[in-house]
Interface confidence: medium
């Protein structure tokens, strides 16, 4: 088992909103849960966009999940990752 490296980034979206993206990379096996949470509770699927779980050329995999949030509410959102029985939570950078 190779645990993922998780990285959260933010980018400007429409006025007053930002897109936050959570990327998991270099993990094996390919089964992973990656989702955004607001106040600890998972967002619905239709408010998130997922990338495919793709091989990264090193025998491991990568994927991402993104959602759009209101600027100023970043503290309320965290990226939740679960892989091979381990889990972690990652905040939005300020």
């Amino acid at each position: 088992t190779v645990p993922p490296m998780v990285n959260v980034t933010r980018s400007e979206a429409s006025e007053g909103n930002i897109t936050v993206t959570c990327r998991a990379s270099s993990f094996y096996p390919r089964n992973i849960i990656l989702t955004w949470r607001q106040d600890g509770v998972a967002l619905s699927h239709d408010t998130q966009q997922w990338g495919d779980v793709l091989p990264d050329g090193n025998g491991t995999y990568q994927t991402w999940v993104a959602t759009r949030i209101c600027r100023g509410e970043e503290q309320r959102f965290t990226c939740y990752m679960e892989h091979s029985g381990n889990h972690s939570t990652h905040p939005v950078p300020s």
Partner: antibody
Framework: QGQMQQSGAELVKPGASVKLSCKTS????????ISWLKQKPGQSLEWIAW????????SYNQKFTAKAQLTVDTSSSTAYMQFSSLTTEDSAIYYC???????????????WGQGTLVTVSA | DVLMTQTPLSLPVSLGDQASLSCRSS???????????LEWYLQKPGQSPKLLIY???NRFSGVPDRFSGSGSGTDFTLKISRVEAEDLGVYYC?????????FGGGTKVEIK
């Protein structure tokens, strides 16, 4: 389900600050969201803020953003709330409570501390 | 803020009676993930509140089946099918769907 043990009663003077503690045991501290709540005598409850023990991330009720500061010490599995510039309006029982997002997929205040009475008086 | 209004303020009951408590929110309390985070708590004198019901109708672990929750949108109800002495106290409804999370003013269930 674990335990949440809060610090003892406090008698403080107006304008002072107080730091309340909530020591936890019996569960993985860093996995949990912990909220603080206020209850004035004979009244209902108010949610102050939560802190995620794993990252220290917080979310505050705007009413308390200038009043409360939440922190955690993962080495001792303890959550803290510092309340500043106290007035008699801050006299209340303050509770810490643990969220249960895992076992029940969304119960807010599943487990509570016993409360700390804060009295603000000159 | 979402205002949670509970009625009645006081509910005198006889042991063994059914009790019905009402909670109304000032706006729809469906979370953006589609769930309705409406909860009921019981607080007995001198004690911390205890969670009874979460997500409108789910009993928390250890809560007797005489407690049931129902409702949707803005109107919610807690029913106690046969009131026992240990059920006396103040019941609070709570919404966790919109920040700031808010409680109702409470309904005191007491002996008639």
């Amino acid at each position: 389900q674990g335990q949440m043990q809060q610090s003892g009663a406090e008698l403080v003077k107006p304008g002072a600050s107080v730091k309340l503690s909530c020591k936890t045991s019996g569960f993985t501290f860093s996995d949990n969201y912990i909220s603080w709540l206020k209850q004035k005598p004979g009244q209902s409850l108010e949610w102050i803020a939560w802190i995620y023990a794993g990252t220290g991330g917080t979310s505050y009720n705007q009413k308390f953003t200038a009043k409360a500061q939440l922190t955690v010490d993962t080495s001792s599995s303890t959550a803290y709330m510092q309340f500043s510039s106290l007035t008699t309006e801050d006299s209340a029982i303050y509770y810490c409570a643990r969220h249960d997002y895992y076992g029940t997929s969304g119960a807010w205040f599943a487990y509570w501390g016993q409360g700390t009475l804060v009295t603000v008086s000159a | 803020d979402v205002l949670m209004t509970q009625t009645p303020l006081s509910l005198p009951v006889s042991l063994g009676d059914q009790a019905s408590l009402s909670c109304r929110s000032s706006q729809n309390i469906v979370h953006i993930n589609g769930n309705t985070y409406l909860e009921w708590y019981l607080q007995k004198p001198g004690q911390s509140p205890k969670l009874l019901i979460y997500k409108v109708s789910n009993r928390f672990s250890g809560v007797p089946d005489r407690f049931s929750g129902s409702g949707s949108g803005t109107d919610f109800t807690l029913k106690i099918s046969r009131v026992e002495a240990e059920d006396l106290g103040v019941y609070y409804c709570f919404q966790g769907s919109h920040v700031p999370w808010t409680f109702g003013g409470g309904t005191k269930v007491e002996i008639k």
